[in-house]
């Protein structure tokens, strides 16, 4: 629990860190370890994330052994006439889990994004609204038609495969990989998920990628020219590099992202393709993640309802007004 | 470019009100949210309160609650910052200056009052 | 909620200097760091503890912990002498210290 001791890692390599968790020297700066999240155990040993501007807090300085993961005081978050103090997390509706961090929201959806396979006992999958249930559930449609048809459209259209097509037989199995989902953040780093049965043993494995569909900074509105209502693809700037959880990557790239609408339309990635990026840490670890990197984008009215300000804005209006 | 400028020099007498709009320019004006900073002559930087451009929400330091009402135009993209029953400690310049984006993923955001008006010089003086 | 600052400090050219502001535990809050010259609006040099907004200079850099925040300015330059304020956020309320008149010699 403390530092008085020498260091003593395990011998496997680093962990794997959930996705948005900084791999961190432990306090003792012994061993890699997983950063504790806000409202998480904390002690000398088990640090809290600093990318996320988190700190242990023990309480009294009698009971310094373990403390709670708490984030800095910072900027409140004001909305619908409440007030939200840096730190604070609250529900927008039954579908957002939104926090404040120094003045600024970020929210995460609470239901499921999960994909499911057409299978034998259910070749047609289809997300419906449930009365009095929140979340769209997975229900089972008997086909109207002979016609197949594939899942729902999904955010991304085509990804530049290379390999097996996604619908071949091999080896007793039927190879079968769903589209990218759409990505989790509409701006900055998040992550798009795809189910696949594409290795050896056939069995359904869940793979993801990085994704930037825009950076939060570009105020991409005041790009549009007088007259039109999307800027699809803006010029694209000055290279970059990525940053993941204090990490930053090795290469700049000159990435192509997605614009805005002003007509209530969504723009979002059309064609995309899956590249490694390698990102070094500032205690030297390189650590390699598959990325998504845009092609061309789309305008359209595919967008989740505005039954909640909180969906309309990120997903419809991106930096939308609340009023 | 980013620019928020301010109504001009007021002079009034104690008790009465006065009213300092700032006009936003050059970003999404509800997308970020707007303070109201004040300094006395002489003196440093005090804070009055906020407001989210985009539902116009507010909140206000405990020292001007009752006293201070900011609203905004989204059609003008412009605050305004009302103060009541000035007296002569009110004489000072008062400053608007952009807040933080309401919503971005956390370590993209810039946290801060990253822009600021040129000020408005209010006179309290019998 | 109240945040210290040395009233003043004074450097020659090309020297590093530092300006602190404390606060009661303020190493638990973001802090901020505006300058500002005579006659002029503040600007944003420094913002949660240690990030600078893109146009500041590299020599500015920030650092909190603790009850105390620091603001360094590494080969000040001439254009460097301003008031310099700390800002600390408070149960939802901004304060700032009383400022820091920084000379260059």
């Known amino acids: 629990q403390n530092c008085s001791g020498p260091c003593r890692c395990p011998d496997e390599p680093a962990p794997r860190c959930p996705a948005g968790v900084s791999l961190v020297l432990d306090g003792c700066g012994c061993c890699r370890v997983c950063a504790k999240q806000l409202g998480e155990l904390c002690t000398e040993r088990d640090p809290c994330d600093p990318h996320k501007g988190l700190f242990c807090h023990f309480g009294s300085p009698a009971n310094r052994k373990i403390g709670v993961c708490t984030a800095k005081d910072g900027a409140p978050c004001i909305f619908g006439g409440t007030v939200y103090r840096s730190g604070e997390s609250f529900q927008s509706s039954c579908k957002y889990q939104c926090t404040c961090l120094d003045g600024a929201v970020g929210c995460m959806p609470l239901c499921s994004m999960d994909v499911r396979l057409p299978s034998p006992d259910c070749p047609f999958p289809r997300r419906v609204k449930l009365p009095g249930k929140c979340c769209e559930e997975w229900v089972c449609d008997e086909p109207k038609d002979q016609t197949v048809v594939g899942p729902a459209l999904a955010a991304y259209r085509l990804e530049d495969t290379f390999g097996p097509d996604p619908t071949m037989i091999r080896a007793n199995c039927l190879v079968q990989t769903t589209e990218w989902s759409a990505c989790s953040k509409t701006c900055g780093m998040g992550i798009s998920t795809r189910v696949t049965n594409d290795n050896a043993s056939c069995r359904l494995e869940k793979q993801s990628r990085l994704c930037m569909v825009r950076p939060c900074e570009a105020d991409l509105e005041e790009n549009i020219k007088k007259g039109k209502k999307c800027i699809r693809t803006p010029k694209i700037s000055k290279p970059i590099k990525f940053e993941l959880s204090g990490c930053t990557s090795m290469k700049t790239y000159r990435a192509k992202f997605c614009g805005v609408c002003t007509d209530g339309r969504c723009c979002t990635p059309h064609r995309t393709t899956t590249l490694p990026v390698e990102f070094k840490c500032p205690d030297g670890e390189v650590m390699k993640k598959n990325m998504m990197f845009i092609k061309t984008c789309a305008c359209h009215y595919n967008c989740p309802g505005d039954n909640d300000i909180f969906e309309s804005l990120y997903y419809r209006k991106m930096y939308g007004d609340m009023a | 470019e980013v620019h928020l400028v301010e109504s001009g020099a007021e002079v009034k007498k104690p008790g009465a009100s006065v009213k300092v709009s700032c006009k936003a320019s050059?970003?999404?004006?509800?997308?970020?949210?707007m303070h109201w900073v004040r300094q006395a002559p002489g003196q440093g930087l005090e804070w009055m309160g906020i407001?989210?451009?985009?539902?116009?929400?507010?909140s206000y330091a405990q020292k001007f609650q009752g006293r201070v009402t900011m609203t905004r135009d989204t059609s003008t993209s412009t605050v305004y910052m009302e103060l009541s029953s000035l007296r002569s400690e009110d004489t000072a310049v008062y400053y608007c200056?952009?807040?933080?984006?309401?919503?971005?993923?956390?370590?993209?955001?810039?946290?801060?009052?990253?822009?600021w008006g040129q000020g408005t010089t209010v006179t309290v003086s019998s | 909620y109240v945040l210290t600052q040395p009233p003043s400090v004074s450097v020659s050219p090309g020297q590093t200097v530092s300006i602190t502001c404390s606060g009661d535990?303020?190493?638990?809050?973001?802090a901020s760091w505006y300058q500002q010259r005579p006659g002029q609006s503040p600007i944003l040099v420094i913002y949660?503890?240690?990030k600078r907004p893109s146009g500041i200079p590299e020599r500015f850099s920030g650092s909190n912990s603790g009850n105390t925040a620091t603001l360094t300015i590494s080969g000040t330059q001439a254009m460097d002498e301003a008031d310099y304020y700390c800002?600390?956020?408070?149960?939802?309320?901004?304060?700032f210290g009383a400022g820091t008149q920084l000379t260059v010699l």
């Open positions: 200056a952009r807040g933080t984006r309401l919503y971005c993923s956390g370590g993209s955001c810039l946290n801060g009052m990253d822009v």
């Open positions: 050059g970003y999404t004006f509800t997308s970020y949210y």
């Open positions: 407001i989210n451009p985009s539902g116009g929400s507010t």
């Open positions: 535990k303020l190493g638990n809050k973001y």
């Open positions: 949660q503890d240690t």
């Open positions: 800002q600390a956020w408070d149960s939802n309320t901004a304060f």
